[in-house]
């Protein structure tokens, strides 16, 4: 079995303010078991946008049903985009751990740019 890769096919996405952004992410393997998380930015100051395992993220929905067998699509939609949402978003695969899951592999990132609403 080849090692899992996290694929973010879009280097950049442009969305108008007030619209919904779709950030695409797929994994290439079911192994290792563990959740996906999305972050804005990289490094220790990165901001958690979505965590499959736990948390409440009212503006975020997953494109696919994550409970369905063989699912490897971890794309998300972020609603009601504002200029403050601009940045680079990373889809990160975690490996099941004890007691805590461990970061395994990150996608290359997708830069979200926000176009102001025409006045």
């Amino acid at each position: 079995e080849e090692e899992l890769q996290v694929i973010q096919p879009d280097k950049s996405v442009l969305v108008a303010a007030g619209e919904t952004a779709t950030l695409r992410c797929t994994a290439t393997s079911l192994i290792p078991v563990g959740p996906i998380q999305w972050f804005r930015g990289a490094g220790p100051g990165r901001e958690l946008i979505y965590n499959q395992k736990e948390g409440h993220f009212p503006r975020v929905t997953t494109v696919s049903d994550l409970t369905k067998r063989n699912n490897m699509d971890f794309s998300i939609r972020i609603s009601n985009i504002t200029p403050a949402d601009a940045g680079t978003y990373y889809c990160v695969k975690f490996r099941k751990g004890s007691p805590d899951d461990v970061e395994f592999k990150s996608g290359a990132g997708t830069e979200l740019s926000v176009r102001a609403k025409p006045s």
């Epitope: 079911l30 192994i31 078991v33 563990g34 395992k53 948390g55 409970t67 067998r69 099941k96």
Partner: antibody, heavy 119, light 110 residues
């Protein structure tokens, strides 16, 4: 930390019903399947059924299809397994288990609930 | 339905020796590039614990003396050097279709 806390031991008469509960914590309840498995005294493991709390999709072992019902209460992150028309050979420890990878496997287990059926 | 048959039903192995448990499926459990076999360890009075998923992948925290192998219909759980704490009943499970378990193999120390 994922935890599955099951209800206490039950003693039932033949022909009665039992409803075992499994309260989940440490993860988003609607993102992962819950399985139910039983083990008669000194015997092996027997899969009963599974439920997706996000949409209540269920799959049953044909042996239990007419007597078992799985439900969930997403407001309390609790799964339930009701077994009807109890017989003495239903005496067993009943386990709930969470499937962390949507692989139809059992990653995290409750401690079990002993159901004794005796006249 | 796919039936899993484990062998042997019980075995006794000396400390430090290799223990091998087999699981045979009545038809192939391979699908979508994966072998849908899982191994569990159950100690007395405890719930089962997942050891191996998708035939050969160790679960989190499982010592590397445990390994899984096989493809299609024949699978093996190997403990390379038996420790006292490995005394337990071991079960295989498939999920090629709806899950079923093997009958279990009781592992004891010789």
């Amino acid at each position: 930390q994922v935890q599955l806390v099951q209800s206490g031991a039950e003693v039932k008469k033949p022909g009665a019903s039992v409803k075992v509960s499994c309260k989940a914590s440490g993860y988003t309840f609607t993102n992962y399947w819950i399985n139910w498995v039983r083990q008669a005294p000194g015997q092996g493991l027997e899969w009963i059924a599974m439920i997706d709390p996000s949409d209540s999709e269920t799959h049953y072992n044909q042996i239990f299809k007419d007597r078992a019902t799985l439900t969930t209460d997403t407001s309390t992150s609790t799964a339930y397994m009701e077994l009807r028309s109890l017989r003495s050979d239903d005496t067993a420890v009943y386990y709930c288990a969470m499937d962390y990878g949507s692989l139809y496997a059992m990653d995290y287990w409750g401690r079990g609930t002993l159901v004794t059926v005796s006249s | 339905d796919i039936v899993l048959t484990q062998s042997p039903d019980s075995l006794a192995v000396s400390l430090g020796e290799r223990a091998t448990i087999n699981c045979r499926a009545s038809q192939s459990v391979r699908s979508s590039g994966y072998n849908w076999i899982f191994w569990y360890q159950q100690k007395p009075g405890q719930p089962p614990k997942l050891l191996i998923y998708l035939a050969s992948n160790r679960d989190s925290g499982v010592p590397d003396r445990f390994s899984g192998s096989g493809s299609g219909t024949d699978f093996t759980l190997t403990i390379s050097s038996l420790q006292a704490e490995d005394v337990a009943v071991y079960y295989c499970q498939h999920s090629r279709e709806l899950p079923t378990f093997g009958q279990g193999t009781k592992l004891e120390i010789k």
